[in-house]
């Protein structure tokens, strides 16, 4: 279920969820809705200062790089 993740614990969780894609602490510019709560809100604010779930963590994964055709 949802839990609070801070510090190295949060980084570990992001690395586990995002894998080789990597992750952002802030969502990239233009990510998702244009009426986000606040431009500076990032994964720390969303998951350390209140509980968050896997889906929330996944929102901060870097996009998959398209694989080149052989």
């Amino acid at each position: 279920g949802p839990e609070t993740l801070c510090g190295a614990e949060l980084v570990d969780a992001l690395q586990f969820v995002c894998g080789p894609r990597g992750f952002y602490f802030n969502k990239p510019t233009g990510y998702g809705s244009s009426i986000r709560r606040a431009p500076q809100t990032g994964i720390v604010d969303e998951c350390c200062f209140r509980s968050c779930d896997l889906r929330r963590l996944e929102m901060y994964c870097a996009p998959l790089k398209p694989t080149k055709a052989a």
């Epitope: 801070c6 510090g7 606040a38 500076q40 350390c48 200062f49």
Partner: antibody, heavy 119, light 112 residues
Framework: QVQLQESGPGLVKPSETLSLTCTVS????????WSWIRQPPGRGLEWIGY???????NYNPSLKSRVTMSVDTSKNQFSLKLSSVTAADTAVYYC?????????????WGQGATVTVSS | QSVLTQAPSVSGAPGQRVTISCTGR?????????VHWYQQFPGTAPKLLIY???NRPSGVPDRFSGSKSGTSASLAITGLQAEDEADYYC???????????FGGGTKLTVLG
């Protein structure tokens, strides 16, 4: 057990830059979130900002244009710089730590550094 | 004016129960952000008293308890003791400000 110690000049002239350092002992600077808070004489606590060693920072909007926080992992220290200070910046400045075991609560504090802005 | 509102002062006699409230809004406490409480004695650094709305760090007596409902949070102290006389601050995160916020603080006076 993580311990914090603030250091820096106790007197800063108006329009100059206030610089403080927080030395961390008993823990790695790369494991936690770090924060600065201040308290003007006889008044309440004001959050200045916090950051993670990776470079993630978040500053109080009212101070953002004047604040810089940085970290020196080799010395296990982090610092605060506040530019263009005025008498209103006179306060006790605290560094604090969010270890992650307290749901974002600042569970370790330095003893505080008194900074007076005066010519 | 603080984003989180606290009464400036509260008082009680030894042995009594006192409550300190912290009123926020939909962008902080009401948005699900955790509330933390700090105790500060004159001339010393604040100390974390309650974290995550209702949890006590080790070493904090169970006379201290925290709760949260809607856009408000409360700190209750039962069996009031002289050594509880201090300033108490609530703290949370505010999404509209993108940062942490403190209440203005409540000075607790133990009578007698």
């Amino acid at each position: 057990q993580v311990q914090l110690q603030e250091s820096g000049p106790g007197l800063v002239k108006p329009s100059e830059t206030l610089s403080l350092t927080c030395t961390v002992s008993g823990g790695s600077i790369s494991s936690y979130y770090w924060s600065w808070i201040r308290q003007p004489p006889g008044r309440g606590l004001e959050w200045i900002g916090y950051f993670f060693y990776s470079g993630y920072t978040n500053y109080n909007p009212s101070l953002k244009s004047r604040v810089t926080m940085s970290v020196d992992t080799s010395k296990n220290q982090f610092s605060l710089k506040l530019s263009s200070v005025t008498a209103a910046d006179t306060a006790v400045y605290y560094c604090a730590c969010i270890t992650g075991t307290t749901k974002g609560g600042m569970d370790v504090w330095g003893q505080g550094a008194t900074v007076t802005v005066s010519s | 004016q603080s984003v989180l509102t606290q009464a400036p002062s509260v008082s009680g006699a030894p042995g009594q129960r006192v409550t300190i409230s912290c009123t926020g809004r939909s962008s902080n406490i009401g948005a699900g952000y955790d509330v933390h409480w700090y105790q500060q004695f004159p001339g010393t650094a604040p100390k974390l008293l309650i974290y995550g709305n209702s949890n006590r760090p080790s070493g904090v007596p169970d006379r201290f308890s925290g709760s949260k409902s809607g856009t408000s949070a409360s700190l209750a102290i039962t069996g009031l003791q002289a050594e509880d006389e201090a300033d108490y601050y609530c703290q949370s995160y505010d999404s509209s400000l993108s940062g942490s916020v403190f209440g203005g603080g409540t000075k607790l006076t133990v009578l007698g």
